[in-house]
Interface confidence: low
């Protein structure tokens, strides 16, 4: 009689993560008598997957009834497959021996490849805010997918970006892979409502790509513009001066009024108005008692926005002149060195 052969008809099997893998194995003879075992990997360090004779293998079921005397089908099913199950599986026939069974013949092996979906892309932006005209980097990461082939695209408000670099790791063969991409985005003053989107397409997603988003509102800082104006007289000896703080983002802002360099009042922006582009406007006013001053008064509106160096604008109030409305442009001056720090 011809010697027993162990036949594994499938050179490779492809299974989606979470599904059940069927690994086929048949023997050509009932002789010699002895159990079958399944291993992952070859050599002495191989991993036992199933032992017909003994042991508990909760994820493994046999296709046919191995207790029947004439059974020659040793196929198994492995449930709830994960990428970690990838590898080459060998169906091995043992010959009854004393005290231990002896390996008699092995099948050629079946390579199990696992198709696994990528995780939801996670997009992260820079740690610190940046101002318009600056270029910032966003990263996108997705993990755990297999096979290796994957497509990643970047969008800003629906427009596809071209300035990005993508790596899929590891470079060689693996049970699963990760993708990491870095995109460069130029900020504009209108980007408070903008979104950056990372889109990942993979064979397991069946044409329905995964998306990760980042709101540029978390990244952008739009510095304010200041305008100081003198309002009409309220009383004979009182002047109302306003400081208009326009087009700033985020809202975190503190304003200090200085009279001739001395702090008069400090307040935090609260009841702001929002512009269509997502930036904010705010106004603060100061009532100045002119009769309390002998000389001209230099009023300064100093704004500290989002923890940045202060920017300020000044207005000269002429005490000698009759307190009527004065235009801000003639008397206003800019502390340019501070402004340079913020922009």
């Amino acid at each position: 009689e011809e010697e027993l052969q162990v036949i594994q008809p499938d050179k490779s099997v492809l299974v989606a993560a979470g599904e059940t893998a069927t690994l086929r194995c048949t023997a050509t003879s009932l002789i010699p008598v002895g159990p079958i075992q399944w291993f992952r990997g070859a050599g002495p360090g191989r991993e036992l997957i199933y032992n017909q004779k003994e042991g508990h293998f909760p994820r493994v079921t046999t296709v046919s009834d191995l207790t029947k005397r004439n059974n020659m089908d040793f196929s198994i099913r492995i449930g709830n497959i994960t990428p970690a199950d990838a590898g080459t599986y060998y169906c091995v026939k043992f010959r009854k021996g004393s005290p231990d069974d002896v390996e008699f013949k092995s099948g050629a092996g079946t390579e199990l490849s696992v198709r696994a979906k990528p995780s939801a892309p996670v997009v992260s932006g820079p740690a610190a805010r940046a101002t318009p005209q600056h270029t910032v980097s966003f990263t996108c990461e997705s993990h755990g997918f297999s096979p290796r082939d994957i497509t990643l695209k970047w969008f800003k408000n629906g427009n596809e970006l071209s300035d990005f670099q993508t790596n899929v790791d590891p470079v060689g063969e693996s049970v699963s892979y990760s993708i990491h991409s870095t995109a460069k985005v130029v900020l504009t003053r209108e980007d408070v409502h903008s979104q950056v989107i990372c889109e990942v397409a993979h064979v397991t997603l069946q044409g329905d790509p995964l998306r990760g988003t980042a709101n540029l509102s978390e990244t952008i800082r739009v510095p304010p513009t200041l305008e100081v104006t003198q309002q009409p007289v309220r009383a004979e000896n009182q002047v109302n001066v306003t400081c208009q703080v326009r087009k700033f983002y985020p809202q975190r802002l503190q304003l200090t009024w200085l009279e001739n360099g001395n702090v008069s009042r400090t307040e935090t922006a609260s009841t702001v108005t929002e512009n269509k582009d997502g930036t904010y406007n705010w106004m603060s006013w100061l009532l100045v008692n002119v009769s309390a001053h002998r000389d001209d008064v230099k009023l300064t509106c100093q704004v500290e926005h989002d923890g940045q160096p202060a920017v300020s604008k000044s207005h000269d109030l002429k005490v000698s002149a009759h307190p009527k409305e004065q235009g801000s442009n003639t008397a206003a001056e800019n502390t340019g060195s501070n402004e340079r720090n913020i922009y």
Partner: antibody, heavy 122, light 107 residues
Framework: EVQLVESGGGVVQPGRSLRLSCAAS????????MSWVRQAPGKGLEWVAS????????YYADSAKGRFTISRDNSKNTLYLQMNSLRAEDTAVYYC???????????????WGQGTLVTVSS | DIQMTQSPSSVSASVGDRVTITCRAS??????LAWYQQKPGKAPKLLIY???SLQSGVPSRFSGSGSGTDFTLTISSLQPEDFATYYC?????????FGGGTKVEIK
């Protein structure tokens, strides 16, 4: 190109220690079981030790047990063999070798490094 | 431990000859056997694994056969570059063991 380069060999007195290194390149080191095999001058090949892909399992020949330690640093793509209490009979060329199959224990060895000579002599 | 016994320990042959080397395991190892070639001063090179599978890049004049305890390496037509020492190795049980080697010399 797949390359394994051993280093750390030399002349050492009996009872002393030596640490061999094997730098791997050209393949993804962390997917393969690795082994050390030695060859005494004019003699045949003798398996010394093997290590699983993630270092979780280590295997030793009887002649190495208790004296030699195999380890690996996958972040540095390097295999090590720490040899303590060296004896004259440990004199040999020591080869590092890669297991042929990914995610497997040591089985067939391919490729091999060029070897490093360890001479234990007083 | 599984003992691997190679025979002959040396063989003299001419270019073009058919050379057969045998390897016997002290107990059954199924098909878990490899053959290596080693030239003086060089590292061993894998020729055959799983008893009969030819390693990539190895000339087809090399072939392996056998299962269980008895295995054979055959060089169908010896070439000048084939003069070397050949080793068998069992790859199923620890400790991994090699045969003593067969030196193929020029006649």
């Amino acid at each position: 190109e797949v390359q394994l380069v051993e280093s750390g060999g030399g002349v050492v007195q009996p009872g002393r220690s030596l640490r061999l290194s094997c730098a791997a390149s050209g393949f993804t080191f962390s997917y393969y079981g690795m082994s050390w095999v030695r060859q005494a001058p004019g003699k045949g090949l003798e398996w010394v030790a093997s290590i699983w892909v993630d270092g979780s399992n280590k295997y030793y020949a009887d002649s190495a047990k208790g004296r030699f330690t195999i380890s690996r640093d996958n972040s540095k793509n390097t295999l090590y063999l720490q040899m303590n209490s060296l004896r004259a009979e440990d004199t040999a060329v020591y080869y590092c070798a890669e297991g042929k199959e990914t995610y497997s224990g040591p089985n067939w060895f391919d490729p091999w490094g060029q070897g490093t000579l360890v001479t234990v002599s007083s | 431990d599984i003992q691997m016994t190679q025979s002959p320990s040396s063989v003299s042959a001419s270019v073009g000859d058919r050379v057969t080397i045998t390897c016997r395991a002290s107990q059954g190892i199924s098909s878990w056997l490899a053959w290596y070639q080693q030239k003086p001063g060089k590292a061993p090179k894998l020729l055959i694994y799983a008893a009969s599978s030819l390693q990539s890049g190895v000339p087809s004049r090399f072939s392996g056969s056998g299962s269980g305890t008895d295995f054979t390496l055959t060089i169908s037509s010896l070439q000048p570059e084939d003069f070397a020492t050949y080793y068998c190795q069992q790859a199923i049980y620890f400790p991994i063991t090699f045969g003593g080697g067969t030196k193929v010399e020029i006649k």
